[in-house]
């Protein structure tokens, strides 16, 4: 249920050297500094729990300030194998190899890891994002070209004494950041091998990882301002529900999205927002400092608990699902984008959710923990919450069983 058991090895309460090791913002991803090769080449790498390849730009690209130059690394080994990764939109392709990798603001270890050297891409790198590669932290089952390509975290755990667990605190700023502010700002923390108790308040609540491919979980109930959406819980997980740091929005299956928007519209009906706002096309703005947070509802997702018939809920505020956006044309106002969108691949708990919580990816015990983040944005009236236990029956029925085909959709 909660994390009140004694500390385990590698789970000491403080990981000072790893705190604040992430930068970025929810709209363009959070990245960690990594070094690759000998001598070390420094790159910023997107932290992505929704994929399983370590892949870095390895050729010039208009959006990259720097890239991995394999010919300059004495420790690079070519695997003489290509890799092609198509997304729903866009793709990247490259050449597989291995090299020595370390994380300067991470555990004091160097590992030999698989690296996909990206030589061609479309709709992958983001202009101005400041990252040059991606660290896929999910499981081997969804690695490309196949599950025989060991993901980085597996290599790290195998080759070192780092415990099989990592945790993420993503800190949304609550206001738009320009390029120089992003470079100077703190984006959050990736604690490799443990849990840092300074990064959350209250208790950690754990939900089982349903299957080790994506970080798949089961949602058993959804409430908007305490009002149950009253849908068959299978709909919430159709065709899966995953925790994905590489996705900006909270993405919901079509039927669930429509019901949620209807409910959020009803709750906030004192103002008439354009249809384009709910689509994520139009911004809504208020005079600086007057955003009426109180008219927007809180959203609660109930997750399967670790104990039979027990669930817990995580609650996010509009401060998480309304994403601040800077626009010169309306610079005198505070403007926001609606950061909940429709999905055809199941529920994706992206940065919008994760920015409310400290999230523990406890791979060793096949579970994901949630606690209220010490850095989440809130106001004086409401705060994000993780609460339980609640009695929920037949939760296993909420999971959807995907007909077995090779299905792997990364970072949308």
């Amino acid at each position: 249920e909660t994390d009140e058991e004694p500390e385990e090895p590698g789970r000491r309460g403080s990981f000072v050297e790893m705190v604040d090791n992430l930068r970025g913002k929810s709209g363009q991803g959070y990245y960690v500094e990594m070094t690759v090769g000998s001598p070390p080449q420094t790159l910023n790498i997107l932290v992505d729990t929704g994929s399983s390849n370590f892949a870095v730009g390895a050729a010039p690209h208009p959006f990259l300030h720097r890239y991995y130059q394999r010919q300059l690394s004495s420790t690079y080994r070519d695997l003489r194998k290509g890799v092609y990764v198509p997304y729903t939109q866009g793709k990247w392709e490259g050449e597989l190899g291995t090299d020595l990798v370390s994380i300067p603001h991470g555990p004091n270890v160097t590992v030999r890891a698989n690296i996909a050297a990206i030589t061609e891409s479309d709709k992958f790198f983001i202009n101005g994002s400041n990252w040059e590669g991606i660290l896929g932290l999910a499981y081997a089952e969804i690695a490309r070209p196949d599950d025989s390509l060991e993901p980085f975290f597996d290599s790290l755990v195998k080759q070192t004494h780092v415990p099989n667990l990592f945790s993420l605190q993503l800190c949304g700023a609550g206001f738009p950041l320009n390029q120089s502010e992003v470079l100077a700002s703190v984006g959050g923390s990736m604690i490799i091998g443990g849990i840092d108790h300074s990064l959350y308040t209250g208790s950690l609540w754990y939900t089982p990882i349903r299957r080790e491919w994506y970080y798949e979980v089961i949602i058993v109930r959804v409430e908007i301002n305490g009002q149950d959406l009253k849908m068959d819980c299978k709909e919430y997980n159709y065709d899966k529900s995953i925790v994905d740091s590489g996705t900006t929005n909270l993405r919901l299956p079509k039927k669930v999205f429509e019901a949620a928007v209807k409910s959020i519209k009803a709750a906030s009906s004192t103002e008439k927002f354009p249809d384009g706002f709910w689509l994520g096309e139009q911004l809504v703005c208020w005079q600086a400092g007057t955003t009426p947070w109180n008219i927007f509802p809180v959203i609660s997702l109930y997750l399967m608990g670790e104990v039979t018939n027990q669930s817990f809920r995580i609650t996010i505020l509009p401060q998480q699902y309304l994403r601040p956006v800077e626009d010169v044309a309306t610079s005198q106002d505070d403007c926001y984008k609606f950061a909940i969108s429709q999905s055809s691949t199941g529920t994706v708990m992206g940065a919008v959710i994760m920015e409310g919580f400290y999230v523990v990816f406890d791979r060793a015990r096949k579970r994901i923990g949630f606690a209220v983040s010490a850095c989440h944005v809130h106001d004086e009236f409401r705060t994000a919450a993780v609460e339980g236990p609640f009695v929920t029956l037949d939760m296993e029925d909420c999971g959807y069983n995907i007909p077995q085909t090779d299905e792997s959709t990364l970072m949308t």
Partner: antibody, heavy 116, light 107 residues
Framework: EVQLQQSGAELVRPGTSVKLSCKAS????????MHWVKQRPGQGLEWIGM????????KNNQKFKGKATLTVDTSSSTAYMQLISLTSEDSAVYYC?????????WGQGTLVTVSA | DIVMTQSQKFMSKSVGDTVSVTCKAS??????VAWYQQKSGQSPKSLIY???HRYSGVPDRFTGSGSGTDFTLTISNVQSEDLADYFC?????????FGGGTRLEIK
């Protein structure tokens, strides 16, 4: 500074097609939808449709279905609109405009003249 | 589709006057209305959003008002450079629609 630079004027034959471009700069291209608007000589403005560069999602005005095809190339931050089966009714200035609140930024327009 | 009607096609004012350009929506569009200025041979320039908010850099001589179905763009202390066509637009629902325009002439 946000800028939308549109391609030059086109003189085309009836029944043919034309592809207009709109190169964006000064903002993150993927973050905002791109709209296209038609203005016939001495007339008002008509909304053709819009495209989300982040995922190619498109919303069209039904009136222009089968006439206009919207695409983007994110690597060059450029939006395109192809107009097919051109007739004299398609002679107009076509503008691209970026989303925000309403349409804060507009390109300079491309004049398309359909003439035999 | 929502029809935006600008009943006055032309208006003629002297420098220093105040002019009100009106726009009527065929159904409730809340405050989701924008106003644009288009000078001859140029592209539209955004003036007002959310019925009454000025875009950055727009002189405070331009004021928007209204909600629901009736909207007004008021230009006080009219200047010669205000000679232009003025269009309203609703962005409450798709397809976005524009008024037919009002031409402001300077006497």
């Amino acid at each position: 500074e946000v800028q939308l630079q549109q391609s030059g004027a086109e003189l085309v034959r009836p029944g043919t097609s034309v592809k207009l471009s709109c190169k964006a700069s000064g903002y993150t291209f993927n973050n905002y939808w791109m709209h296209w608007v038609k203005q016939r000589p001495g007339q008002g403005l008509e909304w053709i449709g819009m495209i989300d560069p982040s995922d190619d999602d498109i919303k069209n005005n039904q009136k222009f279905k089968g006439k206009a095809t919207l695409t983007v190339d994110t690597s060059s931050s450029t939006a395109y609109m192809q107009l097919i089966s051109l007739t004299s009714e398609d002679s107009a200035v076509y503008y691209c405009a970026r989303s925000g609140v309403a349409l804060p930024y507009w390109g300079q327009g491309t004049l398309v003249t359909v003439s035999a | 589709d929502i029809v935006m009607t600008q009943s006055q096609k032309f208006m003629s004012k002297s420098v220093g006057d105040t002019v009100s350009v009106t726009c009527k929506a065929s159904q409730d569009v809340g405050r989701n209305v924008a106003w644009y200025q288009q000078k001859s041979g140029q592209s539209p320039k955004s003036l007002i959003y959310s019925a009454s908010h000025r875009y950055s850099g727009v002189p405070d001589r331009f004021t928007g008002s209204g909600s629901g179905t009736d909207f007004t763009l008021t230009i006080s202390n009219v200047q010669s450079e205000d000679l232009a066509d003025y269009f309203c637009q609703q962005y409450n629902s798709y397809p976005y629609t524009f008024g037919g325009g009002t031409r402001l002439e300077i006497k």
